[in-house]
Amino acid sequence: GLQDPCSNCPAGTFCDNNRNQICSPCPPNSFSSAGGQRTCDICRQCKGVFRTRKECSSTSNAECDCTPGFHCLGAGCSMCEQDCKQGQELTKKGCKDCCFGTFNDQKRGICRPWTNCSLDGKSVLVNGTKERDVVCGPSPADLSPGASSVTPPAPAREPGHSPQDIEGR
């Protein structure tokens, strides 16, 4: 059969029915990420509490993150919410401290239960806090007389938190 002339149009162009199916470049602020498209998609605009992480091009959409003090939620950063402190989680009534037995080491997300060392047959080497999980040590059997000495692991280095950014009202 006859080949669809539009299939020859590469990404960054569209098959223009008004111009005898010529491949026309996507207009400003639009893109087509695949070939053979009959229209170009409008670029996402990172406004308000959103910030542009990657500019739109003729072949790919813009990508947003959040302005300072806010962080992304949802697929493709569909929402921005305010940061909490480490040791807290965001609830409907604002940021709340993690309950005893739980922790959050980031400015976002929920409080998670401390690791239960005993489930792995280990002891607690360092107690947990609102901001840090417990550190499990060797099992009690390893601590019996004659057992080889165990060097406790160095605490994990806390990753730095770069300021979060936001988009429009």
Partner: antibody
């Protein structure tokens, strides 16, 4: 309606610590951040720092070692402290609310003039 | 830090004039720019955010435009209450920074 009101000492001596309180009404500190901005007499605006709804803080690196911002949600108050004062810290100090829609200031207090002089 | 350079630093206008203030960022800030109005002895007042969105209650004669590094605040027909100083602010990254201000005076 949304209101912010700064209260400060007016006059402080060099090397001392400035302490200003911002009392807010018409909104909850549990939901909104509060910025601090200053303006030397006859000059422009300088951002000092912010405390977010969850209590996390971000400061201007040019002053970071001297600035502390804290808050008491139950009292609707935000506290601003600036240590090791010099004459260059003489300014009107403003607190301002951050809306939920951008990192900007939508409502401002009337400001409090702080003069650093011996 | 991102520098915000405003021009002119002052300008004179008559009631009814169209006035334009510009602000240039030292690096790309997307559309993360706000504009404020400040009258003598008063606190600043928010006018525009996201380069072009008017804050609630701001008259339609105020408009903002621009993206990347160049931004404009326009007053389509200056009214007596508009004579004030105007500041731009970027909020794309910390530290938040303001322009030096543009004083709008009566001609």
């Amino acid at each position: 309606q949304v209101q912010l009101q700064e209260s400060g000492p007016g006059l402080v001596k060099p090397s001392e610590t400035l302490s200003i309180t911002c009392t807010v009404s018409g909104f909850s500190l549990i939901s909104y951040g509060v910025h601090w901005v200053r303006q030397p007499p006859g000059k422009g605006l300088e951002w000092l720092g912010v405390i977010w709804s969850g209590g996390s803080t971000d400061y201007n690196p040019s002053l970071k070692s001297r600035v502390t911002i804290s808050k008491d949600n139950s009292k609707n108050q935000v506290s601003f402290k600036l240590s090791s004062l010099t004459a260059a810290d003489t300014a009107i100090y403003y607190c301002a609310r951050n809306p939920l829609t951008a990192t900007v200031m939508d409502y401002w207090g009337q400001g409090t003039l702080v003069t650093v002089s011996s | 830090d991102i520098q915000m350079t405003q021009s002119p630093s002052s300008l004179s206008a008559s009631v009814g004039d169209r006035v334009t203030v510009t602000c240039r960022a030292s690096q790309n800030v997307g559309t993360n720019v706000a504009w404020y109005q400040q009258k003598p002895g008063k606190a600043p007042k928010a006018l525009i955010y996201s380069a072009s969105y008017r804050d609630s209650g701001v008259p339609s004669r105020f408009s903002g435009s621009g993206s990347g590094t160049d931004f404009t605040l326009t007053i389509s027909s200056v009214q007596p209450e508009d004579f004030a100083t105007y500041y731009c602010q970027q909020y794309n990254s910390y530290p938040l920074t303001f322009g030096g201000g543009t004083k709008l005076e009566i001609k």
